[in-house]
Interface confidence: low
Amino acid sequence: GKGDPKKPRGKMSSYAFFVQTCREEHKKKHPDASVNFSEFSKKCSERWKTMSAKEKGKFEDMAKADKARYEREMKTYIPPKGETKKKFKDPNAPKRPPSAFFLFCSEYRPKIKGEHPGLSIGDVAKKLGEMWNNTAADDKQPYEKKAAKLKEKYEKDIAAYRAKGKPDAAKKGVVKAEKSKKKKEEEEDEEDEEDEEEEEDEEDEEEEEDDDDE
């Protein structure tokens, strides 16, 4: 888990490498200055947005190399005894709301799968990402509005849930994931979600300022 010092360091995205480089550059230029993190993040984000694909390429290569490193290290990593694959999730807890992109995916994934039955999960996710990126800001609004409403509802629900107090995980005895017929389906769904989240993360990096301006 988080406490295991032997666990491989998580893989870094191209944007994370870019931010790291920005930080290092800033430190060199201003070794004694304290960093206003939100201001710094905003500047990084603005710079990232105006960078060409060629300029981003360097950081994408770094991310690919780091992903390979992470996968290599994870192959030989043995988690400490008693650590389970899935962390306990209270089934009664409110579900995290979907993002605008996730709602878009829910609508368009069946269409893509229908049109291209042979596409892999990864290719479907890639295509959804391309389609989302190619959808005008105004057309994203219905999804963004719906996502905002669901987020609002989730925040209310989670506040109420927390006020009640979380149930004790140990009493529930549901730490281990069920090894049922459903497991394979769940894993496939998770792969789908992970693909979408990766696309979403890229989207967030690219899109985080659009809301302010539109």
Partner: antibody, heavy 120, light 107 residues
């Protein structure tokens, strides 16, 4: 190589109809938003209409709303513009363009245009 | 709708001179959502700059773009004979609007 080829332009009387086509090649058509942009003789560029990759979303400039319909056939890699109730002020060269987000959300792939003349 | 106003309408300069073309948005436009195009008579427009300041592939470095508030500027540092054309700015913030164009002509 990305290629866009417009066709269907010509001379039409006011109130008449015309259907423009834009044949796309050299890229995965179904992944990209497409647009129609026009240019009246000696005038500037005017965005006419937009369609999302799946065809699920469309939008139009106020000047053509209710008269023009954009559509696409992803199986044929073709974009269309159905123009009804044509007016003299619709006379222009009509360009189809690919909205290429990879180049920064702008369209740098254009056809050479097809001329539409509305005159009696 | 967002209006894009370009100035001047016509700019008369000689080869080797510096050209400064301006484009003002009627409301706030994310700098990422502004492009500049060049168009020559009888040809389709050609993308020069996107994201207000990033040169498109194959565009020489004499072309540069900058932004200050709602004002966007295209600068051509040293005019070449091939640069005399009409230039358009275009926003994508809420759909797509072009400026009316600036004609750059030889003095």
């Amino acid at each position: 190589e990305v290629q866009l080829l417009e066709s269907g332009g010509g001379l039409v009387q006011p109130g008449g109809s015309l259907r423009l086509s834009c044949a796309a090649s050299g890229f995965t058509f179904s992944w990209y938003s497409m647009l129609w942009v026009r240019q009246a003789p000696g005038k500037g560029l005017e965005w006419v209409s937009y369609i999302s990759p799946s065809g699920g979303f469309t939008n139009y400039a106020d000047s053509v709303k209710g008269r023009f319909t954009i559509s696409r056939d992803n199986s044929k890699n073709t974009l269309y513009l159905q123009m009804n109730s044509l007016r003299a002020e619709d006379t222009a060269v009509y360009y189809c363009a690919r909205w290429d987000y990879n180049s920064g959300w702008y369209y740098d792939h254009w056809g050479q245009g097809t001329l539409v003349t509305v005159s009696s | 709708d967002i209006q894009m106003t370009q100035s001047p309408d016509t700019l008369s300069l000689s080869p080797g001179e510096r050209a400064t073309l301006s484009c003002r948005a009627s409301q706030s436009v994310n700098s990422r959502n502004l492009a500049w195009y060049q168009q020559k008579p009888g040809q389709a427009p050609r993308l020069l700059i996107y994201g207000a300041s990033t040169r498109a592939t194959g565009i020489p470095d004499r072309f540069s773009g900058s932004v200050s508030g709602t004002e966007f500027t295209l600068t051509i540092s040293s005019l070449q004979p091939d640069d005399f054309a009409t230039y358009y700015c275009q926003q994508y913030n809420s759909y797509f609007t072009f400026g009316q164009g600036t004609k750059l002509e030889i003095k």
